[in-house]
Interface confidence: low
């Protein structure tokens, strides 16, 4: 059978390295090799490229070498297929290396913000060496900021005779670091080169983005003033690399701004002692380019009745975030403050809050949060200047086996019954929601019985033991990833009742 | 059968030099990319440099760029790694790998896929670099 | 360069039950250039797995890979004494290649 005949013929011309052809044959039922049969410099010479039956043999592909690539010039090209039955030969193409030409990417060597021009970066590169010098390339220019997958694109031509190898791009985000690649083709080429290596630039810097500001309503003190601690962050969207050098905070109770008192700090956090009316707060930040928009915080009167609008709410895990989800009867309500922190014994060490718009759902991801803590989740509803009442759920990102088992101990020992009491393992210990307890009781050299009882009883009463008789005990605390053993407790029970 | 066979270990002192060989047998030896991996005594696997089947160097390891130098030589059926300069740290046995063009699954149209992967290895010269 | 995190470092499994051993790559690599290796006791190590999830010939098909961008898993449905060994992964996207830092696993 003669081989199938070679078709999809494709040819690229590497610009002073290497002229290739590859084509795609059907599935040869037995071995075939190939020949690639070529005319150049306008039909004046001919040479074949083969590949022949020992070691080259099935590879469609064949490419032709210096110093027998000459350009500009059009080529003829045929393939033939051979085996032991005979040759089959492709459909005569024809290749101008003008349109099939791929050069070297060119390099770009600063990526550079101009003076006094805000938003915009000025772009310098040398044109490949290896390049047709009369040709007029034309070029494209990735960009992305430093922490972004996404990729945006310009086009643009530079004649050879510019000699001016910059671009300027704009309309970009204030002092945010972009990385800048940049590609090129001679502009008759379907081929492009291959990416430049990626250089980084930032832009200027400019006054700060603006803030995003929050509270936390601590109980009023004796002396009826109200702690509260006020926290801010760089808005959503702020660039990256802003820096403020410090914050101005003014607060005055509502209605009466002649109250007004201020406080500079460099601090993201202060601590404010109110009375027990309405405040409104103000924060901003600054740097050396002047001041960010101002952020607004109202403090409820210690009186005042909060609305509540969140029913419920479901924390739930995928593979690598946490989902928090609520449902709320406020269709109106379309911003919600989340805080979440470490549900430790002693004061949490890390408290953290974030703004959610448009959605009942927020996310984290996993690696954000420690395995094995339980975190403390509150969601706030904010309808312009209020804050209604939180509504708040425990979650752990990983389960495991809590640290230490129960600590128990044998109360009210009876001749055939014993009460069994055991303390709440410490939360630093649990790794996880403890969804049950299961008492282990064995009489000496007898068989072991259980008894499996809820998370929230802390005691229990044993029953129908053997009189006089020596028994070892110990309790298991359980999450989902499984169980840990408390001490292990002996007992004796008596022979006969005391009153 | 197909057979990589290295040679060259040895005890030399930091600071010293050596040459590692790999003979192959049993397959068309230019057709195939080769690699050297080296393991450190009770540690896992760390790829030093390859070649590829145009003989072209597809690389070094951070640890070892600038000190050691891979090359082949197709008539031997022969692929060497030079190694100056060594070090304590590069106390391990060389592995010399073979990297073969394996296809993976049909992408499409009537185009075939093929990638280049260790698919053999030898079994390894200990190399000792102590004074 | 590239880093490549395998998770757990060891594992004991009994006979007959699955194992599943994670590799994370500090950055995306392409599902191409991704291979998974066994080293046995005393021996060289293995081709096992090429391009995620194309098993090498001569190899058992309890054997599967699956995984892609960063997170890449080495499964064995049903694992048998021979299996015991270090099992690798390494990528051949970018330069320098690198290998995972290894599982050891052991039969219970």
């Known amino acids: 059978v003669l081989p199938a005949k070679p078709e999809n013929i494709s040819c690229i011309f590497y610009y002073e390295e290497n002229f290739t052809c590859t084509w795609s044959p059907e599935k040869e039922a037995s071995y075939t090799w190939y020949k690639v049969k070529r005319t150049y410099s306008y039909g004046y010479k001919s040479d074949i490229c083969s590949t022949d039956n020992s070691t080259r043999g099935n590879h469609a592909s064949c490419s032709f070498l210096p110093p027998t690539i000459t350009n500009p010039d059009n080529y003829t090209i045929q393939v033939e297929a051979q085996n032991a039955d005979g040759i089959m030969k492709s459909d005569i193409t024809y290749w101008n290396l003008d349109a099939i030409m791929k050069i070297e990417p060119p390099e770009i060597f600063s990526v550079k913000s101009v003076l006094g021009i805000k938003r915009m970066l000025q772009i310098k590169w040398i044109r490949p060496v290896l390049a047709p010098h009369s040709s007029t390339l034309k070029y494209t220019l990735r960009f992305r900021t430093i922490n972004s997958a996404y990729w945006m694109e310009v086009n643009f031509t530079k004649e050879d005779i510019d000699r001016d190898e910059t671009y300027n791009l704009t309309e970009l985000q204030a002092f945010t670091e972009y990385v800048m690649t940049l590609r090129c083709a001679p502009a008759e080429s379907m081929f492009w080169s291959g990416w430049s290596q990626e250089k980084v630039g930032t832009t200027e810097e400019e006054a700060p983005y603006g803030l995003d500001l929050w509270r936390v309503l601590k109980p009023a003190m004796v002396d009826g003033r109200r702690p509260v601690q006020l926290m801010w962050k760089k808005a959503t969207g702020a660039p990256v690399l802003e820096k403020a050098l410090g914050y101005n905070i003014w607060y005055f109770p509502e209605n009466n701004t002649n109250l007004t008192e201020t406080v500079n700090t460099t601090n993201q956090t202060h601590e404010l002692y109110l009375g027990g009316k309405t405040y409104w707060v103000y924060v901003v930040s600054y740097n050396s380019l002047g001041e960010s928009p101002v952020a607004t915080l109202r403090i409820p009167a210690l009186n005042e009745k909060t609305f509540q609008c969140i029913e419920a709410m479901q924390a739930c895990l995928t593979q690598d975030q946490l989902v928090v989800e609520w449902q709320s009867s406020a269709p109106e309500v379309d911003t919600w403050m989340v805080e979440w922190f470490p549900d430790v014994d002693s004061e949490p060490s890390s408290f953290s809050w974030e703004s959610v718009s448009q959605a009942r759902n927020w996310t984290i991801q996993k690696d954000e949060l420690k395995p094995l803590w339980c975190y403390n989740i509150s969601v706030y509803p904010v309808l312009r200047d209020r804050v209604g009442q939180p509504y708040s759920t425990q979650a752990y990102v990983q389960e495991g086996i809590p640290s230490a088992g129960p600590v128990t101990q044998a109360d009210s020992i009876g001749v055939k019954t014993v009460t069994i009491t055991w303390k709440e393992i410490p939360k630093s210990k649990r790794n996880g929601f403890i969804k049950n307890y299961t008492i282990f009781y064995q009489a000496e050299d007898g068989k072991e019985f259980s008894k499996t009882v809820n998370s929230n009883i802390l005691q229990y009463r044993l029953e129908s033991l053997t009189r006089r008789t020596s028994y070892s005990l110990q309790v298991m605390a359980s999450t989902n990833a499984g169980g840990t053993n408390g001490t292990k407790i002996n007992f004796k029970t008596l022979s006969i009742s005391v009153l | 059968e197909v057979q990589l066979v290295e040679s060259g270990g040895d005890l030399v002192k930091p600071g010293g030099s050596l040459r590692l060989s790999c003979v192959a047998s049993?397959?068309?030896?230019?057709?195939?990319?080769m690699s050297w991996v080296r393991q450190a005594p009770g540690k896992g696997l760390q790829w030093v440099s390859g070649i590829n089947w145009a003989g072209g160097t597809i690389g070094y390891a951070d640890a070892v760029k600038g000190r050691f130098t891979i090359s082949r030589d197709n008539a031997r059926n022969t692929v060497y790694l030079q190694m100056n300069s060594l070090r304590a740290e590069d106390t391990a046995v060389y592995y010399c790998?073979?990297?073969?063009?394996?296809?993976?699954?049909?992408?499409?149209?009537?185009?075939?896929?093929?990638?280049?992967?260790?698919?053999?290895w030898g079994q390894g010269t200990l190399v000792t670099v102590s004074s | 360069e590239v880093v490549m995190i395998q998770t757990p470092l060891s594992l004991s499994v009994s006979p007959g039950e699955p194992a599943s051993i994670s590799c994370r790559a500090s950055q995306s690599v392409s599902s191409r250039y991704l291979v998974w290796y066994l080293q046995k006791p005393g021996q060289s190590p293995q081709l096992l797995i090429y391009g995620t999830s194309s098993r090498a010939t001569g190899v058992s098909d309890r054997f599967s890979g699956s995984g892609s961008g960063t997170d890449f898993t080495l499964r064995i449905s049903r694992v048998e004494a021979e299996d015991v060994g270090v099992y690798y992964c390494q990528q051949y996207d970018q330069s320098p290649r690198t290998f995972g830092q290894g599982t050891k696993v052991e039969i219970k």
């Open positions: 049993g397959f068309t030896f230019d057709d195939y990319g």
């Open positions: 790998a073979r990297e073969s063009p394996l296809r993976l699954g049909d992408l499409g149209g009537d185009y075939f896929y093929y990638y280049y992967y260790i698919d053999v």
